[in-house]
């Protein structure tokens, strides 16, 4: 099973998503090796000549790094000995999407694994009561999405109801001309009900809930990345 006396080691990655304009992480773990100087980590990207990142003999070696990644990558150096080869990526761009390979060589052997990295934009929605409207309405806003998401409303009381006729959604291009601000208004809302605004694209799904009663307004938001794992 070994090659030249070396064995295959288990390397594990998982599909993840990067939010453009922010830090991202390409996750990769391997069987730990206490001999740090014997560990080589190489990150490669399909279609790119040169390396995304290389770490060997206890330090970074960027001599073969492709220019598009210069100054944008780092491993978590203090975690390499415990089997963490994950890569930190600065200022994620749409062009960073693709298939990456995490290649590991240690004194125990070698191994590699691929991961699919998706890039886009996703953000938490905020729902507020829109008191400016002629009738009671709710305004759901999320500052940054890409690709353009779908927006749907739901209600606890009217489960399964279609709110598309009583809502209006708009997408406004942000200043960097890639991401968009999502605004959706739901009209004719009733009190003592919980409404949900759901925003979803192929990368992420976000939900904002608002409970409106006579005495208070309660809000909750959550964001989940899709197809991770």
């Amino acid at each position: 099973f070994g090659i030249s006396g070396k064995h295959f080691i288990t390397v594990t990655t998982f599909t993840s998503a990067g939010n453009i304009g922010e830090d991202g992480t390409l996750s990769c773990t391997f069987e730990p090796d206490i001999k740090l100087n014997g560990i080589v980590i190489q990150w490669l990207k399909e279609g790119i000549k040169g390396l995304v990142h290389e770490f060997k003999e206890g330090k970074d070696d960027l001599s073969q790094q492709h220019e598009m990644f210069r100054g944008r990558t780092a491993v978590f150096a203090d975690q390499v000995v415990v089997g963490n080869a994950s890569l930190r990526l600065k200022n994620v761009q749409l062009t960073d999407a693709g298939t990456y390979t995490c290649y590991i060589h240690t004194s125990k052997g070698k191994g590699n694994a691929n991961l699919e990295y998706k890039t886009g934009a996703f953000s938490m929605p905020e729902i507020n009561v829109d008191y400016n409207a002629s009738s009671e309405s709710l305004r759901c806003e999320a500052p940054r999405w890409f690709p353009q998401p779908t927006v749907a409303w739901a209600s606890q009381v009217d489960q399964g109801a279609n709110f598309s006729e009583v809502s209006n959604t708009s997408f406004e291009l942000n200043s960097e001309n890639v991401t968009m601000k999502v605004v959706s208004v739901l009209y004719n809302v009733t009190i003592n009900n919980t409404y949900s605004c759901m925003i979803e694209n192929d990368i992420a799904k976000a939900t904002g809930d608002i409970k409106v009663t006579d005495s208070e307004v309660k809000r909750r938001s959550q964001l989940e990345l899709l197809n991770s794992g």
Partner: antibody
Framework: EVQLVQSGAEVKKPGASVKVSCKAS????????IGWVRQAPGQGLEWIGD????????NYNEKFKGRVTITRDTSTSTAYLELSSLRSEDTAVYYC??????????????WGQGTLVTVSS | DIQMTQSPSSLSASVGDRVTITCKAS??????VAWYQQKPGKAPKLLIY???TLQPGVPSRFSGSGSGRDYTLTISSLQPEDFATYYC?????????FGQGTKVEIK
């Protein structure tokens, strides 16, 4: 403890060149970017450029391109800033600073004490 | 290149005041905005990076926020040692850029 120690003050004539050094200690010199920033008397901070000592890669402010060269000597853990064709408006305190994040170019988190360069005829 | 426009250029405030300084990026979106404090004759000191992350050892009265092109440094309750000049830095672009600075003076 991260320390950046810069060379002493310089007085130069217009048209001359100056080379300021920045000796690093307390961390692995080749693993972190080093940047250079200047501050003219009573003025704000101005980014000049930076270098990755592990590979010698550099980035420069367009304003200084052609007049500035940033180099390093890994054997002495020292970074250098050389500015040529000096003019009076280059009179400033020049700072070196380590960039946070190792090979990832982060914000400048540790600074040298500054070197005053005076350009006067 | 991304430019940073900082305002105000100076402000007068009293101990205990809440102070807000803003920086506007000329383009794009990224979270790579840092804030520095500088006192006369001294090197700048990093307070906040990545828009809102407090540098270790920096008092919690300093906070950063922002998104899109607009970024803010807030000092919740000004202390005597906070009278200084503050600079923003954008470091997401290949070419870094500082704001023009805000001098915080005693009223």
């Amino acid at each position: 403890e991260v320390q950046l120690v810069q060379s002493g003050a310089e007085v130069k004539k217009p048209g001359a060149s100056v080379k300021v050094s920045c000796k690093a200690s307390g961390y692995t010199f080749t693993s972190y970017w080093i940047g250079w920033v200047r501050q003219a008397p009573g003025q704000g901070l101005e980014w000049i450029g930076d270098i990755y000592p592990g590979g010698g890669y550099t980035n420069y402010n367009e304003k200084f391109k052609g007049r500035v060269t940033i180099t390093r000597d890994t054997s002495t853990s020292t970074a250098y800033l050389e500015l040529s064709s000096l003019r009076s408006e280059d009179t400033a305190v020049y700072y070196c600073a380590r960039l946070d994040g190792s090979s990832y170019r982060g914000a400048m988190d540790s600074w040298g004490q500054g070197t005053l360069v005076t350009v006067s005829s | 290149d991304i430019q940073m426009t900082q305002s105000p250029s100076s402000l007068s405030a009293s101990v205990g005041d809440r102070v807000t300084i803003t920086c506007k990026a000329s383009q794009g979106f990224n979270k790579y905005v840092a804030w520095y404090q500088q006192k006369p004759g001294k090197a700048p000191k990093l307070l906040i990076y990545y828009t809102s992350t407090l540098q270790p050892g920096v008092p919690s009265r300093f906070s950063g926020s922002g998104s899109g092109r607009d970024y803010t440094l807030t000092i919740s309750s000004l202390q005597p040692e906070d009278f200084a000049t503050y600079y923003c830095l954008q470091y997401g672009d290949l070419l870094y850029a500082f704001g023009q600075g805000t001098k915080v003076e005693i009223k």
